[in-house]
Amino acid sequence: MAPTSSSTKKTQLQLEHLLLDLQMILNGINNYKNPKLTRMLTFKFYMPKKATELKHLQCLEEELKPLEEVLNLAQSKNFHLRPRDLISNINVIVLELKGSETTFMCEYADETATIVEFLNRWITFSQSIISTLT
């Protein structure tokens, strides 16, 4: 079925929501004053070999649990990330965006990445897809 303007708009809004969530996480942790940043950077994330289509979000979905574990280190009294809620929200968006009709086997790059590189990769992906929709 060809995408309608309303489905495109919905996809765009969901991608924008995903983008904002990822940027919020990145801004929250990627601060040179963050006491835990260096230790957070010791965690490794798998990066997609290719990420150009919505189905490739499968690769993000598979790394959400490790992401939540690292985010558990990022809380402070004045910075309430609420990792479980945040990851749950991202998971819902990812599932809607990639669809559940086709099962896609994610292919990962050989090199692992830090949380900052990982977030930047998926932020770039979201921005790229949004730009093709507008």
Partner: antibody, heavy 121, light 111 residues
Framework: EVQLVQSGAEVKKPGESLKISCKGS????????IEWVRQMPGKGLEWMGV????????YYNEKFKGQVTISADKSISTAYLQWSSLKASDTAMYYC??????????????WGQGTTVTVSS | AIRLTQSPSSFSASTGDRVTITCKAS??????????MNWYQQKPGKAPKLLIY???NLESGVPSRFSGSGSGTDFTLTISSLQSEDFATYYC?????????FGGGTKVEIK
């Protein structure tokens, strides 16, 4: 019981290599970072570096970078601190410690008993 | 690196005494409303033991006579009534910035 058990005391000559160990038990070893701390005779405590046993990712105190190597084998829940060429100034007590960083905190809640390293010709 | 200066470096006290140890940081160890300052106790030939974390939180199993306070650059460890098992060296530690650093230690001896 959560514990970190370190390898025994070592007496070495300058220029020799050495690898000391720290074995975790009573908890999920890959869920916590392991840090190494040096205490020279009659002195205070110095942080050396940290390893994430799950990923193998490390971060070192600039002072110790290139002087020591921190590694881990998650299959046997063990972290290591090694020297390729010991110096007399490496004579010290070395402790491993478990880092806790959830929530608003960052501290060492469990320590190994320490490994005494003596380097003398 | 953040320097931590403990005072006094050593002193003598009697059981039952109220003991206060201070730790002054060369710059603030606070981040977004939290103080990244911890206190450890070390006895001769033993590993350090965590007493207080995040400036004022008592570690599980540590007697309530130990307490911590402070924020920014000035912190205090207080032992409300010194017991015989409390004679040891106490270290403050900041975990706000790498490299983590420890104070020089305060040795509490029997008078």
């Amino acid at each position: 019981e959560v514990q970190l058990v370190q390898s025994g005391a070592e007496v070495k000559k300058p220029g020799e290599s050495l690898k000391i160990s720290c074995k975790g038990s009573g908890y999920a070893f890959t869920n916590y970072l392991i840090e190494w701390v040096r205490q020279m005779p009659g002195k205070g405590l110095e942080w050396m570096g940290v390893i994430n046993p799950g990923s193998g990712g490390t971060y070192y105190n600039e002072k110790f970078k290139g002087q020591v190597t921190i590694s881990a084998d998650k299959s046997i829940s063990t972290a290591y601190l090694q020297w390729s060429s010991l110096k007399a100034s490496d004579t010290a007590m070395y402790y491993c410690a478990r880092w806790r960083g959830e929530g608003y905190y960052a501290y060492y809640d469990v320590w190994g008993q320490g490994t005494t390293v003596t380097v003398s010709s | 690196a953040i320097r931590l200066t403990q005072s006094p470096s050593s002193f003598s006290a009697s059981t039952g005494d109220r003991v206060t140890i201070t730790c002054k940081a060369s710059q603030s160890v606070d981040y977004q409303g939290d103080s990244y300052m911890n206190w450890y106790q070390q006895k001769p030939g033993k590993a350090p033991k965590l007493l207080i974390y995040a400036a004022s939180n008592l570690e599980s199993g540590v007697p309530s006579r130990f307490s911590g306070s402070g924020s920014g650059t000035d912190f205090t460890l207080t032992i409300s009534s010194l017991q015989s098992e409390d004679f040891a060296t106490y270290y403050c530690q900041q975990s706000n910035e790498d490299p983590y650093t420890f104070g020089g230690g305060t040795k509490v001896e029997i008078k």
